[in-house]
Interface confidence: medium
Amino acid sequence: SPYSSDTTPCCFAYIARPLPRAHIKEYFYTSGKCSNPAVVFVTRKNRQVCANPEKKWVREYINSLEMS
């Protein structure tokens, strides 16, 4: 899960595999102030999971979420 510092969530590690796409309802990018670039996926149960924006599956999920 992202770590919040002064209300700015940052990620220090990425999830190791894709969650099923159906479990993800939304996403956001962490701030440019964070040391690691990251996408935060929010699951249907409101769990926040840090993901590596360079991974192909992450980009595909973002495209899918944008279209839905």
């Epitope: 590690a13 190791a16 595999r17 894709p18 969650l19 099923p20 159906a22 479990h23 699951t43 999971v49």
Partner: antibody, heavy 123, light 111 residues
Framework: QVQLVQSGAEVEKPGASVKVSCRVS????????IHWVRQAPGKGLEWMGS????????IYAQRFQGRVTMTEETSANTAYMELSSLRSEDTAVYFC????????????????WGRGTLVTVSS | NFMLTQPHSVSESPGKTVTISCTGS????????VQWYRQRPGSAPSTVIY?????PSGVPDRISGSIDSSSNSASLTISGLTTEDEADYYC??????????FGGGTKLTVL
Amino acid sequence: QVQLVQSGAEVEKPGASVKVSCRVSGYPLTEIAIHWVRQAPGKGLEWMGSFEPEDAEAIYAQRFQGRVTMTEETSANTAYMELSSLRSEDTAVYFCATDPYYASSGSNYMEVWGRGTLVTVSS
Amino acid sequence: NFMLTQPHSVSESPGKTVTISCTGSGGSISSNYVQWYRQRPGSAPSTVIYEDDQRPSGVPDRISGSIDSSSNSASLTISGLTTEDEADYYCHSYDGNNRWVFGGGTKLTVL
């Protein structure tokens, strides 16, 4: 340290069902997916499906759809795999394996496997 | 459907180096992490490489993993071979819905 303890060997007749259990210690079931993998004698590893914590529901490999049911009893931290309409080709060792579903990359993420349960289907 | 293909068997002499390939088809192998398992007869698989190139504690550094995006393949390399390395080796990854995918396995014989 996560550990998995599977139920003992089973011998079943064709057409019957078998239910294999997998008790998890050292990690809550609500945080991990439990995958089921089988290995027929002299063959490779075959993924059957998994029970996902997000929805508390299973996803199955297409070839087992309709014949396999994966469930969990969270109070007992135990996962189950039931395979029905058994045939001789289902004779195999059935493994459960953990998948720390939400975990970040790093050594805490690695899968842990049970020792396997031999299921023999014979008339 | 994403698939992983391995050679059925490889053999090499003690002390030498062997590389086992795992080629992806129907998708990019670099989309997700690759694991490698060693399985000795009568035992459950055990992890020798996780997350493409990471070694669990207890696995010697003569065992290494790598990914080559240009050939869409992963490789497991074992140097300084001993008879202890004789086993079946499986590569493993995921498709886009967290379904596990295994290679067919490679039998390593140390001559």
